[in-house]
Interface confidence: low
């Protein structure tokens, strides 16, 4: 685990003296943009517990591995969640501290709850200031549960969370209804990803047995040690007032770690420092108790005395957690009688010994079956034993056999033989077998005969399109079950290979031989039927169709609509990409065109039988031209136009449009609407005197129709310059009478 500690100073009489410090013991931690990566971050997390805005908090960096947050002005500033982030890359870790108001209505009996997957967690909120209203429990800020006020048991409200899973982790709160959220009891629930004593991806590995309240990390199996303890199993106590993974940090102030809460990476959570307890970590342990939160009991034997920071202090001649062990001639401890490793791995083998005088690194050696003696590369010295670690050279099959660990001191010697089995990772002898295929998936039996040693712990199926240079896709499967490769391309060949693994480091075998498996694409057999079509405009057509009802799933990806314009020799194709669709709107068609229309089901690239064709005639784009357009000058500024309605109209005319242009003029023509379509005459006014004009017109129904013939006419005599043409409509007969 990352060596990261968040310290909260709990002297709460004066908020301005409150501070949070994040300390990293990681090499190069917090050095900003240099090669060691991102800096330490320390901040208040307002996502779940929001407090009223106040002056910004002050962040001070003390060297490369420490950052402190100050500037709290009032008690409400303290309530909520604070987090420190440290470590680089994959080791980036967030440590969380939850602060409760000492004056809250409800207080947590215990803030941090670390439980194992599948356990029952019980959160207990103690009534501090009673209110006769319901208690609302929330999880990560969202409503979770309600308890009636009369459900308090011994002055506590309990929330039971049976069979907890990792997603249940987070911030829980208990609040009286209609009370300030700042008066809530806030809890932190940490759910390890494995059951008790287990760790690893499948929770198959056994935890080392963390001592002194250490918690086994569910990802890497390391013990996260309480503040004040160190060692791979937290077996060693630090000196009073020290913390950090190597006891390298010192509590600030003359009173040591008194009044400080320590928060460590999950799954540990938070606690007082070693030797202290209470909600503000200001109470020393009672006699006979020691460790973080004083949770541990000494139970010293043989004249040992209890130290509240380190536990039993043994008299000469005795050792052990409870001073229960006599010093003795050297002895090999807890050596497994049989070990198993995979071929070509370089395992580490540990050999532990105790005795008086105490064994040191050079006094423990390891002997291979061929007589080669290995010396330890590292030794972990603990109060009751020395553990020598041996880095074994790359294993060969000849290394199978009896090995021996030997310890020698001036007090004597001891040895222990144990058997090493070197196993060969499994290699498939055959390719996987194809069971069934569909257009986008293959069902494969991955279990094949293999050379090498079992048991098979993991089967990996590697696959990619044939002749492809892209990366292999990999799926990890259960050895005993068939596997479905999904989201494949239809009608495509895939190269598929099996890789087998056996338990232990280096247990992955070489890939087996490849085989070619091709996805299917059955031809769609259903023939659609055109049910109807509806002209929605001169260039828009709505089409509907049906499919015969047959049992079983519909084989098809969608529909293809085809329109054949025989006059122009052009085909238009429209793809409807849903096999559930039964209607489509075709737009952008050519008005006045005769189309032949059909529809067919498609699957992958295969087309099913086409429907019987339909013949559709779209209306022309607009009405025919008005007939017999005639222009007659009425004065020096007016010309009257008369016409006859177009013939064979497809619908009622909505308006006429008149185009007016000065003959030989270079400017744009002027268009004038005649909005009374029943008219057959209009007077264009505001023209210039003695000027020759060109006129033409067209009708509009849904679209503008064809232009009429162009007519010329000149205004009369010399008059004043007019402002510009305008139009006045009237019935043709009335205009002529005048």
């Amino acid at each position: 685990a990352v060596d990261l500690t968040l310290l909260a100073n709990l002297r709460l009489t004066d908020p301005q003296r409150f501070f949070l410090t994040c300390v990293s013991g990681e090499a190069g931690a917090g050095r900003g943009s240099d090669a060691w990566g991102p800096p330490l971050l320390l901040e208040k997390d307002d996502r779940i517990v929001r407090t009223p805005p106040g002056p910004p908090l002050r962040l001070a960096r003390n060297g490369s591995h420490q950052v402190t947050l100050r500037g709290f002005s009032k008690p409400s500033d303290l309530v909520g969640v604070f987090s420190c982030v440290g470590g680089a890359g994959a080791r980036r870790t967030r440590v969380i501290y939850v602060h409760n108001s000492p004056g809250a209505h409800l207080l947590p009996d215990k803030v941090t709850h670390t439980v194992n997957k599948g356990d029952t967690a019980v959160l207990s909120a103690r009534v501090h200031k009673e209110k006769q209203t319901d208690v609302i429990w929330k999880s990560n800020g969202s409503y979770f549960y309600t308890l009636d006020w009369h459900e308090a048991q011994d002055g506590r409200f309990l929330l039971q969370l049976p069979n907890v899973q990792p997603p249940s982790s987070g911030i829980y709160s208990a609040t009286y209804l209609e009370a300030s959220p700042l008066g809530s009891a806030f809890f932190r629930l940490i759910v390890r990803g494995c059951g008790a004593g287990r760790w690893g991806p499948g929770c198959t590995k056994e935890c080392p047995g963390c001592l002194h309240g250490g918690v086994c990390h569910d990802h890497d199996g390391e013990c996260v040690c309480p503040p004040g303890f160190t060692g791979t199993r937290c077996e060693q106590a630090c000196r009073e007032g020290r913390f950090g993974q190597s006891c390298q940090e010192q509590c600030p102030g003359i009173s040591g770690c008194r009044g400080l809460t320590f928060c460590l990476p999950d799954p540990y959570g938070c606690s007082c420092g070693s030797g202290w307890r209470g909600s503000q970590c200001q109470e020393a342990c009672a006699p006979g108790h020691f460790g973080a939160d004083c949770r541990l009991q000494c139970q010293c034997q043989n004249g040992g005395t209890c130290d509240r920071f380190s536990g039993c202090v043994c008299p000469s001649g005795w050792h052990g957690v409870h001073c229960e062990k006599s010093d003795r001639i050297p002895q090999i401890l807890n050596m497994a009688s049989e070990l198993e490793f995979n071929l070509e791995t370089m395992p580490r083998i540990n050999c532990a010994a105790a005795g008086n005088p105490f064994p040191v690194r050079g006094s423990i050696e390891l002997r291979k079956p061929d007589g080669t003696v290995l010396l330890s590369t590292k030794a972990i010295v603990e109060p009751e034993k020395t553990t020598a670690e041996f880095e074994v050279p790359r294993l060969v099959l000849a290394d199978s056999g009896f090995w021996e660990c030997r310890v020698s001191t001036s007090g004597g010697q001891d040895s222990r033989r144990f058997k090493v089995n070197v196993k060969v990772p499994p290699v498939p002898l055959a390719a996987p077998r194809l069971l069934t295929k569909q257009s986008r998936q293959l069902v494969v039996s991955p279990l094949v005969s293999f050379s090498g040693d079992g048991p098979i712990s993991t089967v990996r199926l590697h696959y990619r399109p044939q002749d492809s240079t892209m990366d292999w896709s990999t799926i990890v499967v259960d050895p005993s079950e068939n596997v479905t490769l999904m989201n494949l391309r239809p009608k495509t060949g895939y190269s598929v290979r099996v890789q087998l693994s056996r338990p232990g480091e280096g247990g992955e075998g070489a890939w087996g031989p490849p085989t070619l498996m091709t996805t299917d694409c059955p031809e769609p057999l259903l023939q659609p039927w055109l049910e109807g079509w509806h002209v929605e405009g001169t260039d828009r057509l709505r089409v509907s169709w049906s499919l015969p009802l047959v049992p079983g799933p519909l084989v098809g990806d969608g529909f293809l609509l085809r329109l054949w314009d025989g006059t122009r020799g052009q085909e238009r194709r429209e793809n409807v990409s849903s096999p559930q669709a039964r209607t489509a709107l075709l737009t952008g068609l050519t008005p006045g065109t005769h189309y032949q229309l059909d529809v067919q089901l498609y699957h992958c690239t295969l087309l099913g039988p086409a429907s019987p064709p339909a013949h559709v005639l779209l209306p022309p784009s607009g009405p025919p031209a008005p007939r017999h357009l005639h222009a007659q000058a009425l004065s020096d500024s007016e010309i009257q136009l008369t016409w006859k309605h177009p013939e064979a109209l497809p619908g009622p005319i909505s308006k006429y449009v008149v185009e007016v242009q000065v003959a030989g003029g270079a400017g744009d023509p002027l268009w004038i609407d005649v909005d009374r379509p029943e008219e057959t005459s209009t007077i264009i006014r505001g023209l210039n005197a003695s000027t020759r004009y060109l006129f033409r017109m067209r009708a509009s129904i849904q679209g503008l129709g064809d232009w009429s013939n162009t007519v010329e006419e000149s205004t009369l005599g010399n008059g004043l310059q007019a402002e510009g043409p305008v139009q006045e409509s009237r019935a043709a007969e009335e205009g002529l009478d005048q």
Partner: antibody
Framework: EVQLLESGGGLVQPGGSLRLSCAAS????????MFWVRQAPGKGLEWVSV????????SYADSVKGRFTISRDNSKNTLYLQMNSLRAEDTAVYYC????????????WGQGTLVTVSS | DIQMTQSPATLSLSPGERATLSCRAS??????LGWYQQKHGQAPRLLIY???NRATGIPARFSGSGSGTDFTLTISSLEPEDFAVYYC?????????FGGGTKVEIK
């Protein structure tokens, strides 16, 4: 696996006494309220009594108040019901039950013990 | 005391049919209501708590609804093992009270 096992039932004369026990296992007994519920032959369920996790609070149905006493021994994971001044209408199967959370609902029940009050 | 009234007293149905059981409180119990199933000679089993939440291990065919005074337990499609007596129970006020029960029997 949660288990609740009642014992101590039997035949008793009106005015007599009996002490029922309920041995609990498979859960943290000291964390939950515990209940006694009874069921007269051929009748429905009737709540009798409840006790808080520490044993500091108790409550009784009016029909048994002053005659029955509920208690628990968390060190032995055992719930008790001391029944005095028994009447014919106390004849029933007595179930002990564990609460889900607070007093929310009774998620585990014992198989019951029959108490018969008759002369 | 809050009286809990269940109806009907008996419901005769065939396997596969939908069962709808009703429970009415003499005053509002908000959503603080549970449903239990009891088979002959056995202890009751918690089905639904707080009106609509299924207890651990209860099949999805059981569902609860309602708030205030009117509550419903629905069994969407009766299985042979569902023929039993069903009780509702309120936890809104002391004393805790149960309904008189609805017997679901095979037609």
């Amino acid at each position: 696996e949660v288990q609740l096992l009642e014992s101590g039932g039997g035949l008793v004369q009106p005015g007599g006494s009996l002490r029922l026990s309920c041995a609990a296992s498979g859960f943290t007994f000291s964390a939950y309220p515990m209940f006694w519920v009874r069921q007269a032959p051929g009748k429905g369920l009737e709540w009798v009594s409840v006790i808080s996790p520490s044993g500091g609070q108790t409550s009784y149905a009016d029909s048994v108040k002053g005659r029955f006493t509920i208690s628990r021994d968390n060190s032995k994971n055992t719930l008790y019901l001391q029944m005095n001044s028994l009447r014919a209408e106390d004849t029933a199967v007595y179930y002990c039950a564990k609460s889900f959370s607070g007093l929310a609902a009774l998620d585990f029940w014992g198989q019951g013990t029959l108490v018969t009050v008759s002369s | 005391d809050i009286q809990m009234t269940q109806s009907p007293a008996t419901l005769s149905l065939s396997p596969g049919e939908r069962a709808t059981l009703s429970c009415r409180a003499s005053q509002s119990v908000r959503t603080y209501l549970g449903w239990y199933q009891q088979k002959h000679g056995q202890a009751p089993r918690l089905l639904i708590y707080d009106a609509s939440n299924r207890a651990t291990g209860i099949p999805a065919r059981f569902s609860g609804s309602g708030s205030g005074t009117d509550f419903t337990l629905t069994i969407s499609s009766l299985e042979p093992e569902d023929f039993a007596v069903y009780y509702c129970q309120q936890r809104s006020n002391w004393p805790l009270t149960f309904g008189g029960g609805t017997k679901v029997e095979i037609k």
